[in-house]
């Protein structure tokens, strides 16, 4: 029975040209992370595997940091970047885990017009 | 002034399936989410899912993954959601709401969606 | 998903009264950033619903001072001051930090 629970950083809305860490933690459950992709929209960005390390896809690879820790720096945001990110974690023997977060990546007229939050 | 224009009331048979549209005007259209919004039984509000003009892209609520699609055609600043195999339980109005720091700021008028054979 | 409750389901009124509607939610709503993505609405028949607060406390443009919002965490709340005819409606509040954003279950302000 997969007993573990995904808690993500939440959902962030941040600015053109800024940067960003997307992180996932998986919690009650004793099941051992084999491997950790972050997707977006069916396209992988990057994999870390538990024996072979990170891997950047080549397309993301200026602009994705590893880390910290299993998560993932965005950086040099563009307004195409805005959409659903997912952490699938696969461990064993419980299965897959996925956590889910939504990056709105704003344009500075936009991010400007009645602007009250802080943004990252 | 930031307006969303829906499509008018349908009624429609079990098992149909039908697409709302939403056009957009007073604003940058690709500068923004679009979400979609069930109200059932004029009380329950239900965020369906949402399309980024910009690229496609799109996030679904999971209870709603297979029952709606949603698209955008830039050129006419439209958002539009098609709902397939209808039933009874999706008789509700739908809403399309611009989203900006994830909340709805502006909605559409409403669609009313009657599936009855 | 992130579920959010909402009190009272139902609020009597006499205009000029000063009214507090409650939202919890089943986890923190502030993100990794320290941002909450907590909004209200107001809903009145026959209308679309209309945006009254975001960002927990910051008045949408055009919404009177009477309407403000506070809390954090996972407990929030919309105060109105000074209740006026067209306030009555019904009242939702709607957390946008986790995926997928969740409505609390609605406040009918109604006269007593």
């Known amino acids: 029975m997969m007993t573990g629970t995904i808690e993500t950083t939440g959902n962030i809305s941040a600015e053109k040209g800024g940067s960003i860490i997307l992180q996932c933690h998986l919690s009650s459950t004793t099941a051992q992370v084999t491997q950790v992709n972050w997707e977006q929209q069916d396209q992988l960005l990057a994999i870390c595997n538990a024996d072979l390390g990170w891997h950047i896809s080549p397309s993301f690879k200026d602009r994705v940091a590893p880390g910290p820790g299993l998560g993932l720096t965005l950086q040099s945001l563009t307004v195409n970047d805005t959409g659903e990110y997912f952490c699938i974690y696969h461990t064993y023997p419980d299965g897959t885990y996925t956590g889910r977060i939504f990056l709105e990546v704003l344009e500075s007229s936009v991010a400007e017009h009645g602007a009250r939050f802080q943004i990252p | 002034e930031v307006q969303l224009q829906q499509s008018g009331p349908e009624l429609v048979k079990p098992g149909a399936s039908m697409k709302i549209s939403c056009k957009a005007s007073?604003?940058?259209?690709?500068?923004?989410?679009m979400n979609w919004v069930k109200q059932s039984h004029g009380k329950n509000l239900e965020w369906i899912g949402l399309?980024?003009?910009?690229?496609?892209?799109?996030s679904y609520n999971q209870k709603f993954k297979g029952k709606a699609t949603l698209t955008v055609d830039k050129s006419s600043s439209t958002a539009y959601m098609e709902l397939l195999s209808l039933t009874s339980e999706d008789s509700a109005v739908y809403y399309c709401?611009?989203?900006?720091?994830?909340?709805?700021?502006?909605w559409g008028q409403g669609t009313t969606l009657t599936v009855s054979s | 998903d992130v579920v959010v409750t909402q009190t009272p389901l139902s609020l009597p009124v006499s205009f000029g009264d000063q009214v507090s509607i409650s939202c919890r939610s089943s986890q923190s709503l502030a993100n990794s950033y320290g941002t909450t993505y907590l909004s209200w609405y107001l809903h009145k028949p026959g209308q679309s619903p209309q945006l009254l607060i975001y960002?927990?406390?910051n008045r949408f443009s055009g919404v009177p001072d009477r309407f403000s919002g506070s809390g954090s965490g996972t407990d929030f709340t919309l105060k109105i001051s000074t209740i006026k005819p067209e306030d009555l409606g019904m009242y939702y509040c709607l957390q946008g930090t986790h995926q997928p954003p969740t409505f609390g279950g609605g406040t009918k302000l109604e006269i007593k």
């Open positions: 960002g927990i406390s």
């Open positions: 709401a611009r989203s900006l720091r994830f909340s709805f700021d502006y």
């Open positions: 007073g604003y940058s259209f690709t500068g923004y989410t």
């Open positions: 399309i980024v003009p910009n690229n496609g892209g799109t």
